[in-house]
Interface confidence: medium
Amino acid sequence: HTAAQDNCTCPTNKMTVCSPDGPGGRCQCRALGSGMAVDCSTLTSKCLLLKARMSAPKNARTLVRPSEHALVDNDGLYDPDCDPEGRFKARQCNQTSVCWCVNSVGVRRTDKGDLSLRCDELVRTHHILIDLRHRPTAGAFNHSDLDAELRRLFRERYRLHPKFVAAVHYEQPTIQIELRQNTSQKAAGDVDIGDAAYYFERDIKGESLFQGRGGLDLRVRGEPLQVERTLIYYLDEIPPKFSMKRLTA
């Protein structure tokens, strides 16, 4: 669906300003912060969402061990620079001229430097591992039911093609969702795994980005799946470049 005509809102992004000023009086929505027009029939890019957030008032059953090159977003929020298509620019700088290189999900992948720092290309994050711990339940969830519900969630809520959900692992109380999407696999119109993971992360935290939705209520055979802790690991097509000082810290 597109932006709702009746009250002119963006179903997939509440951090927008919408008005019926599109062609033929159609509802058109622009992201807060950047003012960029967004497609309300799909997820908004993480870069535009972060920018809007900063502008707003305030198959084996074994678990996966993240690769030594996996990144975790330890830097938190920042006001990113986005390209004309809404993607992260490879180089990000703050107001004090400190710069760093990021991957396609906006996570820093180099040491911080000055304005002379070069980031030749935006390196794609092709593998995302979402690590969840759920609240204690009377018994473990049935793995196949859990797997089916999470795959359905990503397919229907986040519109992510099922082929990009590589695996769902479960060892009570830990759930791991593996998303994989190489540059060559991603066709025009495909939702990016980084955007889907970000929407999921916000949903899990009770901060839904969807218009008029209270929060994620994920159920497995009727029992609410309540997440206590979330960790997301990002693996890039090219390993990150950090100094040994950071790696041994």
Epitope: R135, L153, I204, K205, G214, L216, D217, L218, P224
Partner: antibody
Framework: QVQLKESGPGLVAPSETLSITCTVS????????VNWIRQPPGKGLEWLGV???????NYNSALMSRLTISKDTSKNQVSLKLSSVQAADTAMYYC?????????????WGQGTLVTVSS | DIVMTQSPSSLAVSLGERATMSCKSS????????????LAWYQQKPGQPPKLLIS???SRESGVPDRFSGSGSGTDFTLTISSVQAEDLAVYYC????????FGGGTKVEIK
């Protein structure tokens, strides 16, 4: 737009099986769950059971032994069967859509079908 | 099973007056992860199916007048109508969805 419509026999004899169908339009039964709720005349609401989008079911524990909920996705229908009915099962029977992952709220209801158990 | 208890069972108020009703659950409905409560309020007018008013204990649904407000957390919840209008004559039900679903017995709002 989203619509749910219950259809039932109106009158059922004691000890027989009550069968009601909920026909939906405007959404897919593979994307949303459908709940059954009943309301005896002049009384409150009682949740009976749910057919989840994935095809699994849950029932009110007090009625589990008598209740069966099934669906035919191709016909956009969810069916309720309640066996060994008695006068206490006389009620308005509603089906309602579960709002999926946005909280298990019932935002869309059918108008209900009145079922009387009497000989 | 979670038991939902509503009080009072009926409430007579004058037009323009405030109406307050209570709903108590036999166990906490709070999701500690998202800090949200699995509780909804429904309004049922005579001869009609129920209508969703409030979700997540305090989130008013689209189109619901702002005189309706929900509050509370854990096991104790309240629905308040700040200034009762004639069209608010109805029965109000709370419903938990923390563990499947249970409705409260309802509170009937009548006009004095």
């Amino acid at each position: 737009q989203v619509q749910l419509k219950e259809s039932g026999p109106g009158l059922v004899a004691p000890s027989e099986t009550l069968s009601i169908t909920c026909t939906v339009s405007g959404f897919s039964l593979t994307s949303y769950g459908v709940n059954w709720i009943r309301q005896p005349p002049g009384k409150g609401l009682e949740w009976l059971g749910v057919m989840w989008a994935g095809g699994s079911t849950n029932y009110n524990s007090a009625l589990m032994s008598r209740l069966t909920i099934s669906k035919d996705t191709s016909k956009n229908q969810v069916s309720l069967k309640l066996s060994s009915v008695q006068a206490a099962d006389t009620a308005m029977y509603y089906c309602a859509r579960d709002e999926n992952w946005d909280g298990a709220w019932f935002a869309y209801w059918g108008q209900g079908t009145l079922v009387t158990v009497s000989s | 099973d979670i038991v939902m208890t509503q009080s009072p069972s009926s409430l007579a108020v004058s037009l323009g007056e405030r109406a307050t009703m209570s709903c108590k659950s036999s166990q906490s409905l709070l999701n500690s992860g998202t800090r949200k409560n699995y509780l909804a309020w429904y309004q049922q007018k005579p001869g009609q199916p129920p209508k969703l008013l409030i979700s997540w204990a305090s989130s008013r649904e689209s189109g619901v007048p702002d005189r309706f407000s929900g509050s509370g957390s854990g096991t104790d919840f309240t629905l308040t109508i700040s200034s009762v209008q004639a069209e608010d004559l109805a029965v109000y039900y709370c419903k938990q969805s923390y563990n499947l679903f249970t409705f409260g017995g309802g509170t009937k709002v009548e006009i004095k």
